[in-house]
């Protein structure tokens, strides 16, 4: 997929976009973490290059979100998965991808599922494939609470600034 | 698809439709825009039709939005593709169909990606096929800025004002 | 999709408005349902579960969210569907699945679509399936209007806090 | 100031009709919605149904559907509830009511009463 | 349709008592209640919405809380004009429902 991110000079210079707030003199607490693209078998998430960004309280713990302050929150996630076509001489068996924001609080003692999106994949001989999947909605968070990302068929993600995301911003 | 377009009753009365503002005393600037349905193999962007707006400074220029005021925003779109199946004469050849927001800023000599969802489609005999594509999240913009849309698949649009969108609104 | 648009005159003077104000400059008119998972050949809509709320005014008429006050508003919705593999035996028909918000207003004789994401799905032996369709945007909404969901394939949905939503909040 | 006054209430045989009328002032009469609640002597309140002076937009409660029409006059800043084939238990004070938000009854008229009786 | 059960119906209280009224829906309403006053003759006013949040100009004397099915208007300190009749209210669903009510009278 070429093109889709920014090219290595364009990221150098986009860190330094400024943090910008409309005329409101309230906090409007935001984040915007893209993938790690130099991390090719696992999600990580940052928030220091390209577009991505923390602002007003938001924090990045564990590769968790954390939330500054207590209220509603529209909180949002992106991947894009991509595959080849499976060899004559290999099985295609069916590929299960899956994206989930989670939230893990002191309210609970496991991660809870907020968003979640899925799909089966059946590769098929001289088929390139490629699968997005997007999600977003509006929660009650406490201060402190944690919102997390699970993902299956992590190989096969696409891993640019502009698929695969992760966002949230108090309304 | 069934009842999905106005009649000309209701056509009529929806010209009184308002532009409405919450009550803040500072400005929310919003836009939402739908695709031409009149242009068939291009994309064009209206804000002066059915449900779409343009508020608080939004504005259109070259098929783009452009940034009021420097600030976040929340930037999103839908393309929905559909096709028929391939003759049996005909090769069938995999579709590529994508949707991509971009940034067009001064800060850089090109079209940045910021929003990017991917798809091959495969058509088969008597296989009618559909497919949505969504993606949104939260950007730092600075007035000026050009928000444009690029789609790989035109010709396979269903262009109504419920499935062919690009919008945003400041945080 | 012919006629699902406003007739151009009814485009023309469809930008015309009158401002309207919330009365309480702090309140953030905000809903996110989720579908009734003991119901499970319908979509109900509940806000008292989970994590699902209403506030600030929002209410619930006939599985119809209420506008609380007249304004800008981002709607969305998701839908997870999944089937087995059909049957040798059976013959496999393919299946129109789609997910649409609508608006009613009594201005319409009908539900104006705001929304709508559609997809095909061509079953097959020993493949279950899995689809996620997600979509939102910003609309200009009054007072009282009603915000519903229509889906084809209400039974293939897979109901769950985090797959099957319905939700807005006020600009 | 936000002003509501009823009026056209009185006596009514049983099967007739009543027609009440608020006159609205205040504010931008299109803005919000108007609400109709009512109350029999000596009891609770009861919510009818609104209407949307704006766009007409109605919302009723299913126990007055097909007996209660709500209406407004855009021009006259007056909305108005039509009810029909009265009986003794619709005698009460009717209420129009403007919200801030839509299920809040924030602003309320004086009342206005009508008895059914023959 | 939802039903709001209020109680008591009816309460004897003094001038500085703390006077508490509850209200049962019957069935869970998240935070949508709204608590009204009404004095004889008079049209209600709206004292709190979403369970806790005081409508403008209300005196801070006047609180609600609750969530689910119950909920609890209370007055820290009764003055002589609390004297009337209270609503509850669910705004959760259609058709908005009422309390059958809570008269206050003076001791």
């Known amino acids: 997929l070429p093109g889709v991110g920014l090219t290595p000079s364009a990221a150098q210079t986009a860190r330094q976009h400024p943090k910008m707030h409309l005329a409101h003199s309230t906090l409007k607490p935001a984040a915007h973490l893209i993938g790690d693209p130099s991390k090719q078998n696992s999600l990580l998430w940052r928030a220091n290059t390209d577009r991505a960004f923390l602002q007003d309280g938001f924090s990045l713990s564990n590769n968790s979100l954390l939330v500054p302050t207590s209220g509603i929150y529209f909180v949002y996630s992106q991947v894009v998965f991509s595959g080849k076509a499976y060899s004559p001489k290999a099985t295609s068996s069916p590929l299960y991808l899956a994206h989930e924001v989670q939230l893990f609080s002191s309210q609970y003692p496991f991660h809870v599922p907020l968003l979640s999106s899925q799909k089966m994949v059946y590769p098929g001989l001289q088929e390139p494939w490629l699968h997005s999947m997007y999600h977003g909605a509006a929660f009650q968070l406490t201060q402190g609470d944690q919102l997390s990302t699970h993902t299956d068929g992590i190989p096969h993600l696409v891993l640019s600034p502009s698929t695969v995301f992760f966002g949230a911003f108090a309304l | 698809l069934p009842g999905v377009g106005l009649t000309p009753s209701a056509a009529q009365t929806a010209r009184q439709h308002p532009k409405m503002h919450l009550a803040h005393s500072t400005l929310k600037p919003a836009a939402h825009l739908i695709g031409d349905p009149s242009k068939q193999n291009s994309l064009l962007w209206r804000a002066n039709t059915d449900r779409a707006f343009l508020q608080d400074g939004f504005s259109l220029s070259n098929n783009s939005l452009l940034v009021p005021t420097s600030g976040i925003y929340f930037v999103y779109s839908q393309v929905v593709f559909s096709g028929k199946a391939y003759s049996p004469k005909a090769t069938s050849s995999p579709l590529y169909l994508a949707h991509e927001v971009q940034l067009f800023s001064s800060q850089y000599p090109f079209h940045v990606p910021l929003l990017s969802s991917q798809k091959m489609v495969y058509p088969g005999l008597q296989e009618p096929w559909l497919h949505s594509m969504y993606h949104g999240a939260a950007f730092q913009l600075t007035q000026g800025d050009q928000l444009s849309t690029h789609t790989d698949g035109i010709p396979h649009l269903v262009l109504s004002p419920s499935t062919v969108f690009f919008g945003a609104f400041a945080l | 999709l012919p006629g699902v648009g406003l007739t151009p005159s009814a485009a023309q003077t469809a930008r015309q408005h009158p401002k309207m104000h919330l009365a309480h400059s702090t309140l953030k008119p905000a809903a996110h349902l989720i579908g009734d998972p003991s119901k499970q050949n319908s979509l109900l809509w509940r806000a008292n579960t989970d994590r699902a709320f209403l506030q600030d005014g929002f209410s619930l008429s006939n599985n119809s969210l209420l506008v609380p006050t007249s304004g800008i508003y981002f709607v969305y919705s998701q839908v997870v569907f999944s089937g087995k593999a059909y049957s040798p035996k059976a013959t496999s028909s393919p299946l129109y699945l789609a997910h649409e918000v609508q608006l009613f207003s009594s201005q319409y004789p009908f539900h104006v679509p705001l929304l709508s994401s559609q997809k095909m799905v061509y079953p097959g032996l020993q493949e279950p399936w899995l689809h996620s369709m997600y979509h939102g945007a910003a609309f200009q909404l009054t007072q009282g209007d009603q915000l519903s969901t229509h889906t084809d394939g209400i039974p293939h949905l897979v109901l769950s806090p985090s797959t099957v939503f319905f939700g807005a909040f006020a600009l | 100031e936000v002003q509501l006054v009823e009026s056209g209430g009185g006596l009514v045989q049983p099967g007739g009709s009543l027609r009440l009328s608020c006159a609205a002032s205040?504010?931008?009469?299109?803005?919000?919605?108007i609400h109709w609640v009512r109350q029999a002597p000596g009891k609770g309140l009861e919510w009818v149904g609104y209407n949307n002076p704006y766009n007409d937009g109605t919302n009723y409660n299913e126990k007055f559907k097909g007996r209660a029409t709500i209406s407004s006059d855009k021009s006259k800043n007056t909305a108005y509830l039509q009810m029909n084939s009265l009986r003794a238990e619709d005698t009460a004070v009717y209420y129009c009511?403007?919200?801030?938000?839509?299920?809040?009854?924030?602003?309320w008229g004086q009342g206005t009463l009508v008895t059914v009786s023959s | 349709d939802i039903q709001m059960t209020q109680s008591p119906s009816s309460l004897s209280a003094s001038v500085g008592d703390r006077v508490t009224i509850t209200c049962r829906a019957s069935?869970?309403?998240?935070?949508?209640v709204a608590w009204y006053q009404q004095k004889p003759g008079k049209a209600p006013k709206l004292l709190i919405y979403?369970?806790?949040h005081r409508y403008t100009g209300v005196p801070s004397r006047f609180s609600g809380s609750g969530s689910g099915t119950d909920f609890t208007l209370t007055i820290s300190s009764l003055q002589p004009e609390d004297f009337a009749t209270y609503y509850c209210q669910q705004h959760y669903s259609t058709p908005w429902t009422f309390g059958q009510g809570t008269k206050v009278e003076i001791k």
């Open positions: 205040g504010y931008t009469f299109t803005s919000y919605v």
């Open positions: 069935q869970a309403v998240s935070s949508a």
């Open positions: 979403s369970a806790s």
């Open positions: 009511s403007r919200p801030t938000m839509l299920p809040w009854f924030a602003y």
